[in-house]
Amino acid sequence: AGVFELQIHSFGPGPGPGAPRSPCSARLPCRLFFRVCLKPGLSEEAAESPCALGAALSARGPVYTEQPGAPAPDLPLPDGLLQVPFRDAWPGTFSFIIETWREELGDQIGGPAWSLLARVAGRRRLAAGGPWARDIQRAGAWELRFSYRARCEPPAVGTACTRLCRPRSAPSRCGPGLRPCAPLEDECEAPLVCRAGCSPEHGFCEQPGECRCLEGWTGPLCTVPVSTSSCLSPRGPSSATTGCLVPGPGPCDGNPCANGGSCSETPRSFECTCPRGFYGLRCEVSGVTCADGPCFNGGLCVGGADPDSAYICHCPPGFQGSNCEKRVDRCSLQPCRNGGLCLDLGHALRCRCRAGFAGPRCEHDLDDCAGRACANGGTCVEGGGAHRCSCALGFGGRDCRERADPCAARPCAHGGRCYAHFSGLVCACAPGYMGARCEFPVHPDGASALPAA
């Protein structure tokens, strides 16, 4: 039994152009957290059970708000180590996946929203009880720096934590720095010491005095990148130039990329472009699968044809993203019609409708002419979310149901008397006036003052 420990040193923009903007903004403060998934390094075991060695989630980091105009810094990290306890033997070779997640702390209804910022993966050899190993991994424009180690929990000892060791009550016959171990009282165990000068970052050992190299590194002390040793025979001493007489195998010869990955040479080594679902220097790490529970916010994980192939998440309404980690601004689609106000309640959308409209999306015009008749021969005229009836002569009111009193407005001028009639109104004019509304005076000579033609 023992514990795998991961210490994140920094997460921020990697070197070179195209540095990412900060994942947080003044409008939307956020904080980071990390997830690590460990698998035994042998591919057949990894295929069987994702995160079979265990997984851990960090605490949330401090809240960070971007300073406008400032370059994206390394982001504040959670305190403490990520610890993954293991019950059985430490396998020596293992695969890891480290995910960097962002938790947005805006005023989202229904709580914070998560999004995956970066995912790095690799396969490493590591003996339990050894020193911290440092690593740098890049994911897109982001760079993650971290250290890791595996340590045994007492009374387990050894490079695989499979042997049990107990302190002796009797004076020890072992030399300085050595411990007596069960089951043989006279067996002493020395701490594992690799060959002197063995690179702590790129080398490891399983036996004292040895120096074995991680993928991509070579040389007696694992200090030489693979690509710089690709000359089969150097030019002779008479040659002023350096280089290769016979070109050695290129870093992509024989395609070192597994699982259908494609290889491209880089100035110092090679790079694999991996198919979906695979990660690592050589695409040797099968990625997160449904068994790892990658779908957030109630998302359903739909696996590929085989258990270890890439997954997809079907997201509940209101969430999106490859892991259902992003809350959808469903109101941005402007689902409320006729000027209705959209409210995203998290569990549902609501539209607050303007006066005169109704329905889940304010699609029903309560005042429209559909199904609304104007009585007594009136005709309906729509406009601006309201309707009005243009009534036939002799009728009035909203629906032309009221018999109009044509004389109510006193239409007869100059003291003329108004009489309602079935077809409208009749004015009886006072002496000296004439016209339908008694609007024209009659001149003494008998001519009326009609307007000129």
């Epitope: 449904c290 529970g293 779908c295 109630g298 359903l300 994980c301 509940p316 469903r330």
Partner: antibody, heavy 118, light 108 residues
């Protein structure tokens, strides 16, 4: 209040295609996933598949080669077609709405018994 | 697929007693994406619990859910006459969606 109502023939001949329709009332079919579940007489529940209003579908692998679920938003309906039926497909078929916080079933139709027999 | 095994198959209890129903998964159910349903004869199932422990709308507080990983429990604190029915668990973390075989709670 959302209500679901299954409709379709109660008797289907072996090797034919079972066709059922679910009519949704009291709410729009948009913005939700809609599912079919069945229950053979005296047995447990079996999920058949679901459809999202955007057209996403997912079917139970045990039935996938025979199942089609489709949606008619204009009628607020979704449908199930199960081809090449046998007596083992005799069951009460339920339509249901999938919840907003995950893929559980929050509203169910009352179910319709479909018997496969010649 | 994730296989859900419910136990016991039948539970014989009297009204007022406490009922404890178990649902065990063949592999871990991610994020406690587990639901419980009640089904009475001739009726459709009714959602009781989702997310392993959240009560659905209108469900009395005598129903409670707990558990994570592979072991989940539905507890009915005091059985009412209307609670005698068949109870199903369902996982919704990984496709295909699967149900348990059911536990029948009958009157003793």
């Amino acid at each position: 209040q959302v209500q679901l109502q299954e409709s379709g023939p109660g008797l289907v001949k072996p090797s034919e295609t079972l066709s059922l329709t679910c009519t949704v009332s009291g709410g729009s079919i948009n913005s939700y996933y809609w599912s079919w579940i069945r229950q053979p007489p005296g047995k447990g529940l079996e999920w058949i598949g679901y459809i999202f209003y955007s057209g996403i579908t997912n079917y139970n692998p045990s039935l996938k080669s025979r199942v089609t679920i489709s949606l008619d938003t204009s009628k607020n309906q979704f449908s199930l077609k199960l081809s090449s039926v046998t007596a083992a497909d005799t069951a009460v078929y339920y339509c249901a709405r999938i919840g907003v916080a995950g893929f559980y079933f929050d509203y169910w139709g009352q179910g319709t018994l479909v018997t496969v027999s010649s | 697929e994730i296989v859900l095994t419910q136990s016991p198959g039948t539970l014989s209890l009297s009204p007022g007693e406490r009922a404890t129903l178990s649902c065990r998964a063949s592999q871990s159910v991610s994020s406690s994406y587990l639901a419980w349903y009640q089904q009475k004869p001739g009726q459709a199932p009714r959602l009781l619990i989702y997310g392993a422990s959240s009560r659905a709308t209108g469900i009395p507080d005598r129903f409670s859910g707990s558990g994570s990983g592979t072991d989940f429990t539905l507890t009915i604190s005091r059985l009412e006459p209307e609670d005698f029915a068949v109870y199903y668990c369902q996982q919704y973390g990984t496709s295909p969606l699967t149900f348990g075989g059911g536990t029948k709670v009958e009157i003793k």
